[in-house]
């Protein structure tokens, strides 16, 4: 999906008001310096592409974050403010949620959510030059 035409300001507002708090809750008990940020993004559409991938695509060691509150809210925000945000992606998320049996917060998941926090922070500061 091409995130170019999303309403970035409204997605940013949703992140600041609620998604960010859910990410912090998920990471509670973890030091902010514990993980290095290895995933970066260059502009807002690119940031949303990376956020979508990291939030909804299973990775080795972290089967799925799709059932977490921050993920459900991310999906809702993209569905509302990204025109034509693919129904297949929405449906794929539902299938993933059904497959997931039990909630296990692994170290790999914590690292992944730490990367997500970095991507969201970058999304909120689009005018900063890439390091």
């Amino acid at each position: 999906y091409d995130f170019t035409n999303c309403d970035f300001e409204k997605i940013k507002a949703a992140y600041l008001s609620t998604i960010s708090k859910d990410l912090i809750t998920y990471m509670s008990g973890t030091k902010s310096t514990e993980f290095n940020n290895t995933v970066s993004c260059s502009n807002r559409p690119h940031c949303l592409t990376e956020i979508q991938s990291l939030t909804f695509n299973p990775t080795a060691g972290c089967a799925s974050l799709a059932k977490e509150m921050f993920a459900m809210k991310t999906k809702a925000a993209l569905a509302i403010w990204c025109p034509g945000y693919s129904e297949t992606q929405i449906n794929a998320t539902q299938a993933m949620k059904k497959r997931r049996k039990r909630k296990v917060t692994t170290n790999k998941c914590l690292e992944q959510v730490s990367q997500l926090q970095g991507l969201w922070r970058r999304f909120n500061r689009p005018l900063l030059k890439q390091q």
């Epitope: 309403d7 507002a13 008001s17 809210k73 809702a76 509302i80 025109p83 034509g84 129904e87 449906n91």
Partner: antibody
Framework: QEQLVQSGDEVKKPGASVKVSCKSS????????ISWVRQAPGQGLEWMGM????????NYAEKFQGRVTITADPSTTTTSMELSSLRSEDTAVYYC??????????????WGPGTPITVSS | QSAPIQPRSVSGSPGQSVTISCTGT?????????ISWYQQHPGKAPKLMIY???KRPSGVSDRFSGSKSGNTASLTISGLQAEDEADYYC???????????FGGGTQLTIV
């Protein structure tokens, strides 16, 4: 069963405000969006805006921006729509409608019975 | 953005088929597969008949079907029955500002 129950008929004077409520029952309130749609006498349907309880955000049609406010009380699973600066053209039946599940907010699979609002001096 | 265009009225005999068209633009109907159809009897709330172009909610008869070609969506009702007499509205997702646009409505008369 799943239903939306709306508040009763209203008669208002031009310039006044009106608030219509919509009580949800039989489904998980936070999993859906609630939209408001109006229908003037003998006319078609018009989407006004929606509230997404999961995010606590609203989205309004440009035509109604600044004049409509949609709020929710999750404790009573009630959504309210307030329309201000009423004029005679606002005379219509106002429906609350549930946006589809699984984030498919753009179709409406459950409707309230409608609340007639008459604006007359 | 203006409302998608529907014929004001269509008619058919019991057992026949009718098709109601809904013509929009590339910014709404042509741009997304987010088209719904609603049936409304006089004095009643609308009822969802078709969503996402051609999907039927549970409980809706398979006599109702939807399709889309370019900027035009269509609702076909086969084997017309007396209770099908009602107003029919198409609706389309129309981007993040307008969000949903309803067509002007079509009155179906069973003759």
């Amino acid at each position: 069963q799943e239903q939306l129950v709306q508040s009763g008929d209203e008669v208002k004077k031009p310039g006044a405000s009106v608030k219509v409520s919509c009580k949800s029952s039989g489904f998980t309130f936070g999993s859906y969006a609630i939209s408001w749609v109006r229908q003037a006498p003998g006319q078609g349907l018009e989407w006004m805006g929606m509230l997404v309880p999961l995010l606590g955000v609203t989205n309004y049609a440009e035509k109604f921006q600044g004049r409509v406010t949609i709020t929710a009380d999750p404790s009573t699973t009630t959504t309210s729509m307030e329309l201000s600066s009423l004029r005679s053209e606002d005379t219509a039946v106002y429906y609350c409608a549930r946006g589809g599940s699984n984030y498919l907010y753009w179709y409406f699979d459950l409707w309230g019975p409608g609340t007639p609002i008459t604006v007359s001096s | 953005q203006s409302a998608p265009i529907q014929p004001r009225s269509v008619s058919g005999s019991p057992g026949q088929s009718v098709t109601i068209s809904c013509t929009g633009t590339s910014s709404d109907i042509g741009g997304y597969n987010r088209i719904s159809w609603y049936q409304q009897h006089p004095g009643k709330a609308p009822k969802l008949m078709i969503y996402d172009v051609s999907k039927r909610p549970s409980g809706v008869s398979d006599r109702f079907s939807g399709s889309k070609s370019g900027n035009t969506a269509s609702l076909t009702i086969s084997g017309l029955q007396a209770e099908d007499e009602a107003d029919y509205y198409c609706s389309s997702y129309a981007g993040t500002d307008t969000f949903v646009l309803f067509g002007g409505g079509t009155q179906l008369t069973i003759v």
